[in-house]
Amino acid sequence: SPYSSDTTPCCFAYIARPLPRAHIKEYFYTSGKCSNPAVVFVTRKNRQVCANPEKKWVREYINSLEMS
């Protein structure tokens, strides 16, 4: 999960395994102020999961969410 310092959530580790796409509701990018670039996926259980934006599966999921 992202760590929130004040109102800016930042990620210090990424999930290793791809989430099932069906379990992802939405996503957002963490702030440029964070030391690690990250995509945060919000899941069907309203969990926030940090993912590496350089991973192919992450980019594919973002594209698919943008189109839906």
């Epitope: 290793a16 395994r17 791809p18 989430l19 099932p20 796409r21 069906a22 899941t43 259980k45 839906s68």
Partner: antibody, heavy 117, light 111 residues
Framework: QVQLVQSGAEVKKPGASVKVSCRAS????????IHWVRQAPGKGLEWMGG????????IYAQNFQGRVIMTEDTSTDTAYMELSSLKSEDTAVYYC??????????WGQGTLVTVSS | QSVLTQPASVSGSPGQSITISCTGS?????????VSWYQQHPGKVPKLIIY???ERPSGVSDRFSGSKSANTASLTISGLQAEDEADYYC???????????FGGGTKLTVL
Amino acid sequence: QVQLVQSGAEVKKPGASVKVSCRASGYALTELSIHWVRQAPGKGLEWMGGFDPEDGETIYAQNFQGRVIMTEDTSTDTAYMELSSLKSEDTAVYYCATDLTGSRDSWGQGTLVTVSS
Amino acid sequence: QSVLTQPASVSGSPGQSITISCTGSRSDIGYYNYVSWYQQHPGKVPKLIIYDVTERPSGVSDRFSGSKSANTASLTISGLQAEDEADYYCSSFSSGDTFVVFGGGTKLTVL
């Protein structure tokens, strides 16, 4: 591309246990979520359980809860499915699979488990 | 008994089109746009032919197409060929305790 290679066929007696292995290559096991699906002779596909990365734990189908254990050895990129208290109805081909229902879906070749006295 | 309901068998002549239905509920097909279809020849591993309701993996013929309306998904095979004779299974993510649910399978016979 992920490749999954399973262990060979097994013959077991009722009441015994069986442990089927599934070795991953192309990706590390820590980057995959392995699921297990079985198919009894002449029957359909049945999901048994698998790793849910959202919760970070293995989840099992109700039908198998208490009788199946799915484990991983990340040092050898091998997943295992152990089914205990075997009955004749457990005679089936057991498949490991990853990215079930997704575009990168990949299946092992299947392992036939025969339960016979 | 399978969670998703498919006809046990369908048949068609070469060149014809056939449709296989797969009926679920509001907690699986009706809840997600993530329905898949598998083709399985006797003694072989199931092969993914449709995912995300309508998408085809690379290498799968465009004679295979998928659709969905409410709680029912459909697989259409056009220009039937002898090699299409196989069992076809639908599957869907589930919002319940079960991660993935499958249909009971449909045997396609090419006459």
